[in-house]
């Protein structure tokens, strides 16, 4: 922000009233009028070229200090050059010399050189030549020259010739200001600028109205530099929730609108189902039937737990099921839907009922699924069993309803049993299975039939109440299709797959495992 | 030494037209402003004309706008009065003056000038 | 127009004598005031410029002050080539009004 200027003293604007003193008195610098584009201008005026040896002064009236630390002297001058004179003048000087003086009281015309400090020579940029004279053109040269740091009550300038030929237009004497500033929401007083040229005055801001800073933030500071100007801003101040920036000031959110934090960001908007917020609202409430997850932003629409999933199927393989359902029709207005599957058994006899995670397998973990099916294994032959698929939300916890869908399917059959060759040799197979362990229980005898491959006609089939069996008086070297099946009370099971298994040539006799 | 020299006066009847020449030695003519100045019989001094060093500005007393035309040639040294439709009222002694700025010792032109040096003078006297 | 007032219109002098003559100007025109001495016959001389500035070779005796509407001329002590008339003339406005003279006669 640009520097205030408090003006001390203006010759210029004092339309000649001022009367400053000259010594020595009647001679040298004197008050004369022009007139300039039309209007009266006063200036002090010396032209003493001609004669050496010259030392004619004019001291300011006194100026009263007040709070200024350093002043500022600005000169408006014309010089004439010196060659413009008749054989040159030579004793003809083209600058003359500016003087300052400290008092608490003013002396009046009490006038003494010795109390008088120079502060600089004043040398024109720009001197006035003959045509430049003879057309009126005056050659405006301006100065600024500062003095500080300042400790009385107030002081005198003087302006000492030498023998130059200078008209003074303009002294104007002031100090400087950092003005009253709001930046950052944060508003800084009016400060007198320091009289050093490198320190900086550091100046606490104050928050405007419904502004703070922000949690974690430096206060905000800024510093008055020597030429009135604010420099370094450090820290901030922002809006408070329920208000927003608007120009310099802290404004609250129209009604229809919310702002949840400190922050830079505007007010925003109501989201969808909420309720109309009033005016410097923080927060939206949700609609009734509508809600808020704890980590949902605030600019969020508010949502609702989903409907259940559309459509469950459940497709029996012997003892598993693979359960399949397509996403809510209503997902609630959310994109975090997780499903979460429970399984029910119930004996056909007794018609009991109970929960059966325990003794069944999923695909995947059976809660917080993303997926639209999970397969269920290990399931007892001969029961009924009840699949609930649950649809869930961000904000399903926030309600007692659930919303899910349910199937039922009947196991008629155990797994098919799993088949290997454990060993063989040219005229048997040795061969085992497994099946679920609750399964297990069921079996009474397991069945194994077999035939050679390519015969469709005949085919053998062995018995046994355990896991294996040897096949024996097999033809060497030849292929035979095996198939494995479990007997229950209420029937067959269901049927391995058909594994073909081939014995050995007579040349590579022996034992051997596979 | 600044010399001027006028000529071209006599008598003229009214309605008549006269020129008047100065002639300028001893000095820069063209760093001087040049002026006519006149002067009725036992009356005193009147402004007339004045021209700057290079041919321009010119001025006009109100009583010879229109009538009379200042002009100055720099470098036959020479200021001239062109006189047209001259009235009894312009009987006078014309004289021909000039100012350097050299010589006026302020640091500010005044708002017009004074006159440092005269010529002798012409009479010109208009009668029927 | 500026009018410039000479006063008074003859004075009568000796030798020696401090003499001074006034000119007014009808409005202020600062200190742009010039003096002139003219003897019968002959042409007029520049004394003095910017109401107190005397002017190349014009002796001591002669000084101006004033400023604004007020000016005067003085003699300091009359000498006998001093027995002329005087003229103020204004150079504050394009018109440079001359007053209309000053006649110093021997008494």
């Known amino acids: 922000a640009q520097g205030k200027e408090v003006v001390l003293l203006d010759f210029a604007a004092a339309g000649g009233e001022l009367g400053w003193l000259t010594h020595p008195y009647g001679k040298g610098w004197d008050l004369m009028q022009n007139i300039m584009n039309d209007m009266p201008i006063y200036m002090y005026s010396v032209c003493n070229v001609m004669s050496g040896d010259q030392d004619n002064w004019l001291r300011t009236n006194w100026v009263y200090r007040g709070e200024a630390e350093r002043i500022f002297i600005e000169l408006k001058f014309t010089v004439r050059d010196c060659n413009s004179f008749p054989g040159g003048a030579s004793s003809c000087k083209e600058t003359f010399n500016l003087y300052y003086a400290e008092s608490d009281l003013d002396y009046g015309t009490n006038f003494q050189k010795r109390l008088f400090t120079k502060i600089d020579t004043i040398a024109p940029d720009e001197i006035t030549v003959s045509s430049d004279f003879e057309a009126r053109h005056v050659k405006l040269n301006v100065e600024e020259r500062s003095v500080g740091p300042l400790t009385r009550k107030g002081f005198y300038l003087a302006f000492q010739d030498i023998g130059a030929c200078v008209a003074l237009l303009s002294v104007r004497v002031y100090y400087k200001k950092c003005p009253e500033l709001l930046q950052s929401l944060a508003r800084f007083p009016e400060t007198i600028a320091g009289s050093d040229a490198p320190s900086l005055a550091t100046v606490a801001g104050t928050c405007v109205d419904h502004a703070v800073v922000p949690p974690g933030g430096e206060e905000p500071r800024m510093h008055c530099a020597v030429d009135g100007e604010w420099l370094v801003p450090i820290g901030q101040c922002l809006c408070q929730a329920g208000y927003e920036k608007v120009e310099d000031a802290c404004q609250a959110c129209s009604p229809g609108f919310f702002k949840f934090e400190v922050s830079e960001s505007p007010c925003l908007e109501c989201p969808e189902h909420t309720l109309p917020s009033p005016e410097g609202a923080t927060s939206c409430e949700c609609e009734e039937g509508f809600f808020r997850a704890p980590q949902d932003p605030m600019s969020m629409p508010c949502t609702r737990p989903p409907s259940a999933p559309h459509y469950l199927t459940a497709v029996g393989m012997g003892a598993k099921v693979e359960l399949r359902w397509t996403p809510p029709q209503d997902s609630g207005g959310r994109e975090d839907i997780v499903y979460s599957v429970t399984c029910e058994q119930c004996w056909p006899e007794s018609g009991e009922c109970g929960p059966c995670e325990s003794s069944v397998r999923y695909s995947e973990p059976p809660h917080g699924l993303t997926r639209t099916s999970v397969t269920v294994s290990d399931l007892e032959p001969h029961m009924n069993y009840t699949f609930t698929v649950e649809a869930r939300n961000g904000v399903s916890g926030l309600v007692t309803s659930r919303s899910f869908r349910t199937a039922s399917v009947s196991i008629n059959q155990t797994e098919p049993p799993k088949v290997r060759l454990e060993g063989r040799s040219t005229t048997s197979l040795s061969v085992s299975w497994s099946i679920p362990p609750p399964q297990q229980s069921r079996v009474w005898k397991y069945e194994v039939t077999y035939r050679k491959k390519g015969d469709s006609n005949s085919y053998n089939v062995r018995r046994t109440e355990g896991f294996s069996v040897t096949l024996d008086d097999l033809a060497p070297d030849t292929t035979y299709l095996v198939q494995v099946q479990a007997l229950t009370q209420e029937g067959q099971g269901a049927g391995s797959k058909v594994h073909e298994f081939q014995t050995l040539s007579p040349e590579g006799s022996g034992s051997l495992a596979v | 030494e600044v010399q001027l020299l006028e000529s071209g006066g006599g008598l003229v009847q009214p309605g008549g037209s006269l020129r008047l020449s100065c002639a300028a030695s001893g000095f820069t003519f063209s760093h001087y402003m040049m002026a006519w100045v006149r002067q009725a019989p036992g009356k005193g001094l009147e402004w007339v004309s004045r021209?700057?060093?290079?041919?321009?500005?010119?001025h006009y007393a109100d009583s010879v706008k229109g009538r009379f035309t200042i002009s100055r040639d720099n470098s036959k040294n020479t200021l001239y009065l062109q006189m047209n439709s001259l009235r009894a009222e312009d009987t006078a002694v014309y004289y021909c003056a000039g100012y350097d700025s050299g010589y006026d010792y302020v640091a500010v032109a005044g708002p017009a000038e004074y006159f440092q040096h005269w010529g002798q003078g012409t009479l010109v006297t208009v009668s029927s | 127009d500026i009018q410039m007032t000479q006063s008074p219109s003859t004075l009568s002098a000796s030798v020696g004598d401090r003499v001074t003559i006034t000119c007014r100007a009808s409005?202020?025109?600062?200190?742009?005031l010039a003096w002139y001495q003219q003897k019968p016959g002959k042409a007029p001389k520049l004394l003095i410029y910017?109401?107190?500035n005397l002017h190349t070779g014009v002796p001591s005796r002669f000084s101006g002050s004033g400023s604004g509407t007020e000016f005067t001329l003085t003699i300091s002590s009359l000498q006998p080539d001093d027995f002329a008339t005087y003229y103020c003339q204004q150079y504050n406005s394009y018109s440079r009004t001359f007053g209309q003279g000053t006649k110093v006669e021997i008494k």
């Open positions: 409005q202020s025109i600062s200190t742009w």
């Open positions: 021209i700057g060093p290079s041919g321009g500005p010119t």
């Open positions: 910017k109401a107190s």
